[in-house]
């Protein structure tokens, strides 16, 4: 299985969809689990309704909800109020007996809210930077200085 990346914004909701063959997985409950380490077990977070015919009903565990469109063949997981600690590897699973087939491997990435930066407190305004071509450099995540290069001075 390839891993599908889903990106969400911190504090907002993220919907993860896992398509599957509805005939092949007919009658099977589904689950959403979190991968614990590269080779570790997949820890169950939430699963669909105990009665397969009621799989369309939303089931919730904390901020995570799951619902299954068994006819269309789409499992949907919603992560509410996404937080940095929600980032990581997950799986959508199809359950049969004590076994579980992987429907999709998922990587959840949590992006900083553009209005909720860690640098939200710096009172930056564009008008003070407008005259400096590279004023944004000091805010980039990482930047290597070339030999002999002088770091760009703060704008204020």
């Amino acid at each position: 299985h390839n891993t599908t990346v889903f990106q969400g914004v911190e504090g907002q909701s993220l919907q993860v969809s896992c398509p599957y063959d509805s005939m092949k997985h007919w009658g099977r409950r589904k689950a959403w689990c979190r991968q614990l380490g590269e080779k570790g077990p997949c820890q169950r977070v939430v699963s669909t309704h105990n009665l397969w015919l009621l799989s369309f009903l939303r089931r919730r565990n904390g901020s995570t909800a799951i619902t299954d469109d068994t006819l269309g063949g789409t499992l949907t997981i919603t992560l509410r109020n996404l937080q940095p600690h929600d980032a990581g590897f997950y799986q959508c699973q199809s359950l049969h007996g004590s076994e579980a087939d992987t429907l999709r491997k998922v990587l959840v990435e949590v992006l900083a809210d553009p209005l909720d930066h860690r640098d939200a407190g710096d009172l930056w305004v564009p008008g003070e930077s407008e005259s400096f071509e590279d004023a944004h450099v000091e805010h980039s995540i990482s930047r290597s200085l070339l030999e002999g290069e002088i770091p760009f001075p703060p704008t204020s």
Epitope: D122, P126, G127
Partner: antibody, heavy 122, light 113 residues
Framework: EVQLLESGGGLVQPGGSLRLSCAAS????????MGWVRQAPGKGLEWVSA????????YYADSVKGRFTISRDNSKNTLYLQMNSLRAEDTAVYYC???????????????WGQGTLVTVSS | DIVMTQSPDSLAVSLGERATINCKSS????????????LAWYQQKPGQPPKLLIY???TRESGVPDRFSGSGSGTDFTLTISSLQAEDVAVYYC?????????FGGGTKVEIK
């Protein structure tokens, strides 16, 4: 739930002093710039002052520069505005507001407190 | 300092009709590095503090109904309420977030005709 609660307003004589406080809750206060905006009775909004998250930067409107001092105590989640040499034209509702923004966004005010009334009169 | 000028001072519009508020800045608030205009709009209902509606001239704050829209660039901006509702009665302010000192427009009062 994010809450900002101003206090310290009241009636003061011209030339007098007042210290306004704004108690913040429901968010990580120390991550955010904060500001004061005032509104004279029946008038529009006037930005007064702002302070960066770590208190390293402060800004003031020309109308209050040299008379007002903004400060914050991140350990107490509280913003302050020390107002000296008050004038009749400083009479207004003073709102405390969180400065939403950051690099590439620029400072906008949200959310706001309910405000505290400062009346300067003899 | 950037001076913000709003027009009209007040506006009476029938329910369901369009309301248009203008805001002009004394200098451009367009940041060339990202091509964004640093202009915000606020709504202040009677007896309440202001509420942020729009930033970057046209980006709606989450939870703001889509009947509110912002447009314009450089120095001339518009807030449009496409279909006025009773709950939209308020004073609307523009604010530049381009340069310190931050400045607000004088406000536009929107009423129902």
């Amino acid at each position: 739930e994010v809450q900002l609660l101003e206090s310290g307003g009241g009636l003061v004589q011209p030339g007098g002093s007042l210290r306004l406080s704004c108690a913040a809750s429901g968010f990580t206060f120390s991550n955010y710039g904060m500001g004061w905006v005032r509104q004279a009775p029946g008038k529009g909004l006037e930005w007064v002052s702002a302070i960066s998250a770590n208190a390293g930067k402060t800004y003031y409107a020309d109308s209050v520069k040299g008379r007002f001092t903004i400060s914050r105590d991140n350990s107490k989640n509280t913003l302050y505005l020390q107002m000296n040499s008050l004038r009749a034209e400083d009479t207004a509702v003073y709102y405390c507001a969180s400065l939403r923004g950051g690099y590439e966004v620029g400072p906008t005010f949200d959310p706001w407190g309910q405000g505290t009334l400062v009346t300067v009169s003899s | 300092d950037i001076v913000m000028t709003q027009s009209p001072d007040s506006l009476a519009v029938s329910l369901g009709e369009r309301a248009t508020i203008n805001c002009k800045s004394s200098q451009s608030v367009l940041y060339s590095s990202n091509n964004k205009n640093y202009l915000a709009w606020y709504q202040q209902k009677p007896g309440q503090p202001p509420k942020l509606l729009i930033y970057w001239a046209s980006t709606r704050e989450s939870g703001v109904p889509d009947r509110f829209s912002g447009s314009g660039s450089g120095t001339d901006f518009t807030l449009t309420i496409s279909s006025l509702q009773a709950e939209d009665v308020a004073v609307y302010y523009c604010q530049q977030h381009y340069l310190w000192p931050i400045s607000f427009g004088g406000g536009t009062k929107v009423e129902i005709k």
